[in-house]
Amino acid sequence: LIIGFGISGRHSITVTTVASAGNIGEDGILSCTFEPDIKLSDIVIQWLKEGVLGLVHEFKEGKDELSEQDEMFRGRTAVFADQVIVGNASLRLKNVQLTDAGTYKCYIITSKGKGNANLEYKTGAFSMPEVNVDYNASSETLRCEAPRWFPQPTVVWASQVDQGANFSEVSNTSFELNSENVTMKVVSVLYNVTINNTYSCMIENDIAKATGDIKVTESEIKRRSHLQLLNSKAS
């Protein structure tokens, strides 16, 4: 969490950003909040990116003002216009690319004063893994698949019964480049699994950590997955 304060002149206002990660090829949100003003026409929001000459986005007098917008962001940004009045300056970013990573500044002017805060934005690819029993294999085998990761993640297997066990000798992980030649499909196979046990396939890179669990009993199979972004620090 980064909290910034205003500089000289008018009073300073508090601006808060949250470091976040964008999944390439999808929408991203750059989070920024500020002390609200009662008049929308008095609020100016500017988003800037380190190393980029033009603005990422500007919103003033109740509407977008894109005359200074850098070409790399044209048609790809929007604020949540109906939420600006309550202090939400977050930016929606279309079709996140690897090159969108970097340091952004959320700069706010209101009738109360000015303020800004920086935000570190990471980009990559992350997806939920799915763990299934591989019935084609000769022995009891689990297959963990996740369609899109970048950079290349690590894959670790764990089990509820054999806590702390190292499964690297009985697992095999492969990374297959997807058609766009950036992200990769992750496939990990775990051999010699036992019944009545819960196994977890954990996939992690510097952006996200995802876990796929599977519980195999004589009568049923239960699955659960979850994904967590690793760098959501507020400023």
Epitope: E26, L66, G75, S179
Partner: antibody, heavy 121, light 107 residues
Framework: EVQLVQSGAEVKKPGASVKVSCKAS????????IGWVRQAPGQGLEWIGD????????NYNEKFKGRATLTADTSTSTAYLELSSLRSEDTAVYYC??????????????WGQGTLVTVSS | DIQMTQSPSSLSASVGDRVTITCKAS??????VAWYQQKPGKAPKLLIH???TLQPGVPSRFSGSGSGTDYTLTISSLQPEDFATYYC?????????FGQGTKVEIK
């Protein structure tokens, strides 16, 4: 309610130009991209290009570059498509459509009724 | 430029049938695929955007899915008013592109 009302049907000779208008109401005209799409008789949809009236920024399908010109008049909330050097293959219904997402170029969510342009000698 | 290859170009189905239409992008990955329904003499109507987000007022029998370069529109139980032509649209890049269309006819 978002409304896009287009100009009436046109008949043009090969080599001539046509200018189709699209009057917007029910939203802030300068805050949303407007796209243009055409459909030849019995054929599919073909994207021509789009314009952001708040700054005049445009994107064009390579096929129409140099022949199609997109403009917008913010005082009347009207977008225009001008197509020059017309040929018989340009006979089609031309649609304007608002792009969802304001300054973010989204999918086309509201459409005009279409304008039939016939090119015939 | 990204091309969208839509299949089939036409299909015959009965009321109550499950119908699936696919679109394949020539390159790249993004979730910016929309689906439109068009009836003769009418403007297209947006059904789904961002791969799977249903437009307000669109019946829940319509659904979208896909990832990578392959995207699907599914009508779970075809109704009489669903007989129309359907188009996919790729809108993630600078240049937008429609699929060639799929005409859904009565068997």
């Amino acid at each position: 309610e978002v409304q896009l009302v287009q100009s009436g049907a046109e008949v043009k000779k090969p080599g001539a130009s046509v200018k189709v208008s699209c009057k917007a109401s029910g939203y802030t005209f300068t805050s949303y991209w407007i796209g243009w799409v055409r459909q030849a008789p019995g054929q599919g949809l073909e994207w021509i290009g789009d314009i952001y009236p708040g700054g005049g920024y445009t994107n064009y399908n390579e096929k129409f570059k140099g022949r199609a010109t997109l403009t917008a008049d913010t005082s009347t909330s009207t977008a225009y498509l001008e197509l020059s050097s017309l040929r018989s293959e340009d006979t089609a219904v031309y649609y304007c459509a608002r792009l969802d997402g304001s300054s973010y170029r989204g999918a086309m969510d509201s459409w005009g009724q279409g304008t039939l342009v016939t090119v015939s000698s | 430029d990204i091309q969208m290859t839509q299949s089939p170009s036409s299909l015959s189905a009965s009321v109550g049938d499950r119908v699936t239409i696919t679109c394949k992008a020539s390159q790249g990955f993004n979730k910016y695929v929309a689906w439109y329904q068009q009836k003769p003499g009418k403007a297209p109507k947006l059904l789904i955007h961002y791969t799977s987000t249903l437009q307000p007022g669109v019946p829940s029998r319509f659904s979208g899915s896909g990832s990578g370069t392959d995207y699907t529109l599914t009508i779970s139980s075809l109704q009489p008013e669903d007989f129309a032509t359907y188009y996919c649209l790729q809108y993630g890049n600078l240049l937008y592109a429609f699929g060639q269309g799929t005409k859904v006819e009565i068997k």
